[in-house]
Amino acid sequence: LVVTPPGPELVLNVSSTFVLTCSGSAPVVWERMSQEPPQEMAKAQDGTFSSVLTLTNLTGLDTGEYFCTHNDSRGLETDERKRLYIFVPDPTVGFLPNDAEELFIFLTEITEITIPCRVTDPQLVVTLHEKKGDVALPVPYDHQRGFSGIFEDRSYICKTTIGDREVDSDAYYVYRLQVSSINVSVNAVQTVVRQGENITLMCIVIGNEVVNFEWTYPRKESGRLVEPVTDFLLDMPYHIRSILHIPSAELEDSGTYTCNVTESVNDHQDEKAINITVVESGYVRLLGEVGTLQFAELHRSRTLQVVFEAYPPPTVLWFKDNRTLGDSSAGEIALSTRNVSETRYVSELTLVRVKVAEAGHYTMRAFHEDAEVQLSFQLQINVPVRVLELSESHPDSGEQTVRCRGRGMPQPNIIWSACRDLKRCPRELPPTLLGNSSEEESQLETNVTYWEEEQEFEVVSTLRLQHVDRPLSVRCTLRNAVGQDTQEVIVVPHSLPFKV
């Protein structure tokens, strides 16, 4: 690229006209402040391209950088561009105007920065001061760029004298920023709301001082924008929060809400999403099934659990035989309903050292103004079996009988067994099961009674032995779902004078 005049620094008269020419082997263009001003482009017969920029009626505001660059950098050295700096000394222009963002200088580390106060005349003496101080700071000045050095977090101004008047620049603010990788968290006051209620979401970024939040949400897609509010959590340093608040939600507001956070210093970004459901009205729904018959074991503790979903939070009541239950002062019953997630609940009834009287019909009812659900079951108290009596008798009929009586819940099964070789029984020889077969020459008669008050079954079984010719060990075993109990008796023949 060939620039005429070559510069690199030109000082031009105010109100004059000046022509800049740039030529190259490919199309060239003049740029000023990242824009292309009106210019005359041409191609010569020898294939050289040129662009002529005519600056007319120059003022101090034309002071600055001018670049000539290839219009199309394909296949060319992309970094080839020529820079000219033009001064137009203009007593009517003090310091060149800055964009608002140039007045705020952000630092993420201790590094040299430039306070870009520039004048139109390279002959002017410019000094740098703290905003509230008169002493000139010993910082080198470049008329094309400004003051460069390492600065503290303060406010600064530049001063110069044009003719007989002192001119001050705008104030420049230097800030040292806390910057780290971005970590976004999004949460909602509620992820489920009824229509007409408010949706409030919060997006929080930790470890950064300057970030940009951008929300996307269902309402935005239909062009209905909501203005988020950003604040700093004063009690937590470097916590910035953006709040998106949608009053009076509609069903169409259901969907994904995304918070995208960008940090321009290091160009980091992160985003998180959350789903919001807007329901027409509240609900209560049972999750999973609870059998209509539940069991508890006597004197053991038992927790009965119901899981359900609800919004808004419901009231939960437990009933036994249609009477309301509450936490008992004696600590025999404990009720608790806990929120395991925003809309999921676990309600528990705990019976401590279960008593027979606690058997019955239980109901859990969960309800609010929009819906209700209830779940009922029968609680059965299981009682381990015990043999209450085992006796042998010799009726006049000549047969011998053994009577076994026991109780338990659920209903016990009875098993009779006998062993004829007392020396080897029961370790070496298994006992023989007795029943209603003729081989055993025994008969069995069993009666079962349910005792309502005690809520358990009583089993009475009588074993009739036709003839006993030698001592016999007879065992009565009662079994149910929660245990078993055994007793045994030695039955001796009529002819023997003793029993054991």
Partner: nanobody
């Protein structure tokens, strides 16, 4: 003090022609552009034609096709050939040169002006 010397003005009838000349002193190192400006009574000064050191020319719309600017770099001369003159071309015509003596600082200087009057 740099002095530009103009010549060639005068009274001419509508449709007639005039050629203006302007000479810059030899002490000038480099000229960026030389041009002709005019100022009619009660009006602001306006550009008529401009020629750069590279020979690029610029004209005011009102004179395109009628006036021609040309230059001689070696002699540091600029000329304005004015044809098909109209009464509205009546004005004082000033020569202007933007030049440098050190390639960094550029100055623009004006001639004293030469009167052109187009009238029947």
């Amino acid at each position: 003090e740099v002095q530009l010397v103009e010549s060639g003005g005068g009274l001419v009838q509508p449709g007639g022609s005039l050629r203006l000349s302007c000479a810059a002193p030899g002490s000038i190192v480099s000229i960026n552009n030389m041009g002709w400006y005019r100022q009619a009574p009660g009006k602001q000064r306006e550009l008529v034609a401009l020629i750069t050191s590279g020979g690029t020319t610029t004209y005011a719309d009102s004179v395109k096709g009628r006036f021609t600017i040309s230059g001689d770099n070696a002699k540091k001369m600029v000329y304005l050939q004015m044809n098909s003159l109209k009464p509205e071309d009546t004005a004082v015509y000033y020569c202007n040169a933007v030049f440098t003596t050190d390639t960094r600082n550029w100055y623009d200087y004006w001639g004293q002006g030469t009167q052109v009057t187009v009238s029947s």
